[in-house]
């Protein structure tokens, strides 16, 4: 291929041609097609959908489309032995049982293979005991219970409301508190927006609706039986006792009708404050156990789910780059759903499908991107990001040498208020520039840019006139690319005006009511928000794959590094005496950040001035930009989390969904006042400052002139 091939035809087929080819009507059609039956990971239906997508991507014009299969640990309810929770009297008789399934939505009554609500990877068991209400089961909730209220959860079954943090963290916290079972429920305070009707008449959660979800604590490991390596035909698998991240106590989710029956009888301590009260007409007593009249009654869980090694299928499509075929820009989102996947994931998969179609159309007219674009339809995301992680493990050597960027494409919407973006600082300027060129779909912003409506509705807390862009956490398929491999990553979707409820999801999340009709009737009837998300995701991929100089600005990393250093120093300053006693200094970190800032500034100047017609110098500068994210990777990983290797960002140890900056230092400082050996604890803080300072300095040096 001639090195001019891409640029010769770019004027005719530029970003505008790509964006103009994206059509809302197509996204709507694709969403309908993808949501008529369940596509649970490991099922025949999801395999058939993989083959359909493979076939359609080939028709759209990709150079190759392959299935990549792996045999991973999944979890399913026992079809003949259903899971449920009972209230039992002193004779052991079941006087109340929770429902065995969600009432199906209208039009779906005869659909087979709707998996009943369950907590994936729960062990089997039938524990019985007194109930303790633990609010959201966050770290701070258990601190409140154990330290302030002196309530012991040991040997108790705890009931926690969904929301605020990833459910796996709730289960981990309950296990550490000594609980013998966990009941998860959706409280209307978190999953029922005031003034909106329940599905099918609105987008709120009905009382019989239940959120499914995995309860693993994988910390980036992928398949629990093959951490670090692909689950291929010759894999060595750990025994189940050595599997990564499996919960040790039974867990089950319920809706708020059933939760009402359990919570209304609660006795013991009153809730410590109003933040522990939801919206049910119950006292929200903490327990333990039921009140007076019901004090002899207990709660019993009946969990019979099984863990099974099952085949999963990713679809991997390739559009070869004309100039730099060995540089990969990846657009990936998952295909597997809990039930119909109306929002999660198919609102994202439909957008990816339309992006592939648009790229394919351009390719059929003779265009190619400068760099290779890989498109991925991941399997088993809902079971722990398994498809993406196994594929990245299998291809890690290629990815770490050739990976330019990863753009995630799960749910396109979680609301219809404004844009939400989480990405590496390297992509801030790309996102700003792109959204300035796109039209806002928002009412009241006709003729205005997406940047303008986004900035107005979601302003940056630090920089006036700019929109908020958040840190990447986890809970989605970018995890392995960013947190393990250090590939610059980003994600974008339309969201709600509900900042306080950031991590609770939309009301019908992971329920049977997440249907095509939910989207078409209530969220996005014109599919204009889907189209905007397609333009943002697709536009980012286009620019990353096609711009001559990579659209990364290393100066934005300098800005956030200073902010993060200041934040972590401020946390440490809450212990001034200990800092003095143990000679804890952040000077090395601030020095490294200062050096990074100066070197990044000089690099940016050189980037403006160098001879872009010299392919060797161009490639050299682009490689420095590509490898900057990689330079933040510590090959040893974070303490006890070897697959979280990014020193600047990691998923919070207390909430997988949230990103934490300087996570090594943060975790070393967390609750340090309670550590039994303060000298050792502060020694670890000092070690983590050293690791962070070294890493920032080392990253800075990758931007220095090469010789």
């Amino acid at each position: 291929k001639s090195s001019n091939e891409a640029t010769n035809i770019t004027p005719k087929h530029n970003m505008k041609a790509f964006l103009d080819e994206l059509k809302a009507e197509n996204i709507k059609k694709f969403l309908y097609n993808f949501t008529q039956i369940p596509h649970l990971a490991g099922t025949e239906q999801n395999f058939q959908l993989a083959k359909q997508i493979q076939s359609q991507w080939k028709e759209f014009g990709l150079d190759s489309v392959e299935l990549a299969h792996y045999d991973v640990l999944l979890s399913y309810p026992n079809k003949t032995h259903p899971n449920y929770i009972s209230i039992i009297n002193e004779d052991g008789n079941e006087i109340f049982n929770t429902s065995l399934f969600e009432p199906p939505p209208p039009g779906y009554e005869n659909v087979s293979d709707i998996v009943p609500p369950f907590s994936a990877f729960s062990p089997q068991g039938m524990p019985e005991g007194d109930l303790v209400y633990v609010n959201y089961a966050r770290t701070e909730d258990f601190f409140k219970l154990e330290r302030d209220m002196k309530i012991n959860c040991s040997g108790k079954i705890v009931i926690a409301r969904y929301g605020k943090v990833f459910r796996g963290n709730k289960v981990k916290n309950a296990q550490l508190a000594g609980a013998k079972g966990v009941i998860l429920y959706s409280d209307p305070a978190d999953y029922f927006a005031p003034g909106v009707k329940s599905y099918p008449d609105g987008w709120n959660l009905p009382g019989g609706g239940v959120q499914r979800g995995n309860i693993l604590n994988l910390n980036g490991a992928g398949d629990p039986l093959t951490p670090g390596y692909p689950a291929n035909e010759y894999a060595y698998r750990r025994g189940i006792a050595e599997a990564v991240g499996l919960p040790s106590i039974p867990v089950h989710p319920i809706g708020y009708y059933d939760a009402q029956k359990l919570l209304e009888k609660m006795g013991g301590s009153a809730p410590p404050d109003s933040s522990w009260r939801g919206s049910l007409k119950v006292p929200y007593n903490v327990g333990p156990g039921f009140t007076g009249n019901f004090s002899t009654q207990k709660v019993k869980m009946h969990i019979h789910s099984t863990n099974e090694v099952t085949r999963i299928y990713n679809v991997i499509g390739t559009l070869r780059g004309a100039v730099e075929p060995d540089r990969y820009v990846i657009l990936g989102g998952h295909r597997d759903s809990w039930v119909f996947g109306g929002i999660d994931p198919q609102s994202g998969a439909a957008v990816v499908h339309e992006i592939v179609r648009s790229f394919g159309t351009l390719k059929k007219e003779g265009w190619r991107p400068r760099r290779t674009i890989l498109f991925a339809s991941w399997d088993a995301e809902e079971f722990g990001l398994l498809g993406s992680t196994e594929w990245a493990e299998e291809n890690s050597r290629l990815l770490q040498e050739r990976g330019v960027a990863y753009i995630n494409a799960d749910s396109s919407i979680e609301g219809n208020y404004t844009l939400r973006v989480d990405c590496t600082p390297l992509m801030y300027s790309l996102v700003h520039n792109l959204t300035k060129e796109l039209k806002s779909p928002d009412e009241g912003f006709e003729g205005k840019s997406l940047y303008e409506s986004w900035t107005k509705k979601s302003p940056s807390p630090e920089f006036s006139g700019m929109p908020r862009i958040s840190k990447l956490g986890s809970g989605n398929d970018f995890e392995v690319f960013f947190q393990r491999l250090g590939i610059a990553s980003g994600r974008a979707r339309y969201t709600k005006n509900w900042e306080t409820n950031k991590f609770s999801g939309y009301p019908l999340y992971h329920s049977v009511y997440e249907t095509y009709e939910l989207v078409e009737k209530f969220y996005d009837p014109m599919f204009k928000y889907h189209l905007t998300v397609a333009q943002v995701r697709g536009g980012m991929v286009f620019e990353l794959a096609n711009s001559i100089v990579l659209p990364f600005d290393c100066r934005d990393y300098a800005v956030v590094l200073r902010k993060y250093a200041d934040k972590i120093y401020s946390i440490s300053m809450k212990h001034p005496q200990e800092m003095k006693t143990y000679s804890v200094s952040f000077d090395s970190l601030f020095s490294a950040v200062k050096n990074f800032t100066e070197i990044a500034s000089k690099f940016s100047e050189r980037l403006q001035d160098f001879d872009k017609s010299n392919p060797i110098v161009l490639r050299m500068m682009n490689d420095q930009l590509m490898f900057l994210e990689r330079a933040f990777i510590d090959p040893l990983g974070l303490p006890d989390r070897p697959f979280y290797r990014h020193v600047i960002y990691a998923p919070s140890s207390h909430n997988k969904y949230a990103g934490e900056s300087f996570p090594g230092i943060y975790d070393a400082l967390f609750d340090i006042e309670s550590k039994v050996d303060p000298s050792k604890a502060w020694g670890e803080v000092k070690r983590q400052i050293y690791v962070a300072a070294f890493t920032v300095q080392a990253a800075a040096e990758t931007l220095s002139e090469v010789a």
């Epitope: 200073r562 200041d566 120093y569 401020s570 000077d587 601030f590 020095s591």
Partner: nanobody
């Protein structure tokens, strides 16, 4: 010379108020968080409050929450601590701590003594 100078300390009765100031010279602190730290006689250092760089967010030790308010005026390079409903246990030397935008080491003031006594 880069320095922070606290003022506003003194002797005050329980229940009364004081306002501490911390003026920066040779120093621009708008880029960083600023902190108040105190040391009671014969005791170790104790963190009191932090105000983050844009002034929109602040944090306090539990014992002063609802009584003390930290604020900053970046144009005047000055940090404040409004102390209301003072108690005997608030008696201490109060230090402000900051970081100049170009410096890598934190800067501590010399402190101002607050005595709460009837």
């Amino acid at each position: 010379e880069v320095q922070l100078v606290e003022s506003g300390g003194g002797v005050v009765q329980p229940g009364r108020s004081l306002r501490l100031s911390c003026a920066a010279s040779g120093f621009t602190f708008s880029s960083y968080a600023m902190h108040w730290v105190r040391q009671a006689p014969g005791k170790g250092l104790e963190w009191v409050a932090t105000i983050y760089q844009d002034g929109s967010e602040s944090e306090y030790v539990d014992s002063v929450k609802g009584r003390f308010t930290v604020s900053r005026d970046d144009a005047k390079n000055t940090l404040y601590l409004q102390m209301d409903s003072l108690r005997a246990e608030d008696t201490a030397t109060y230090y402000c701590v900051g970081r100049d935008s170009t410096s890598i080491t934190p800067v501590w003031g010399l402190g101002t003594l607050v005595t709460v006594s009837s």
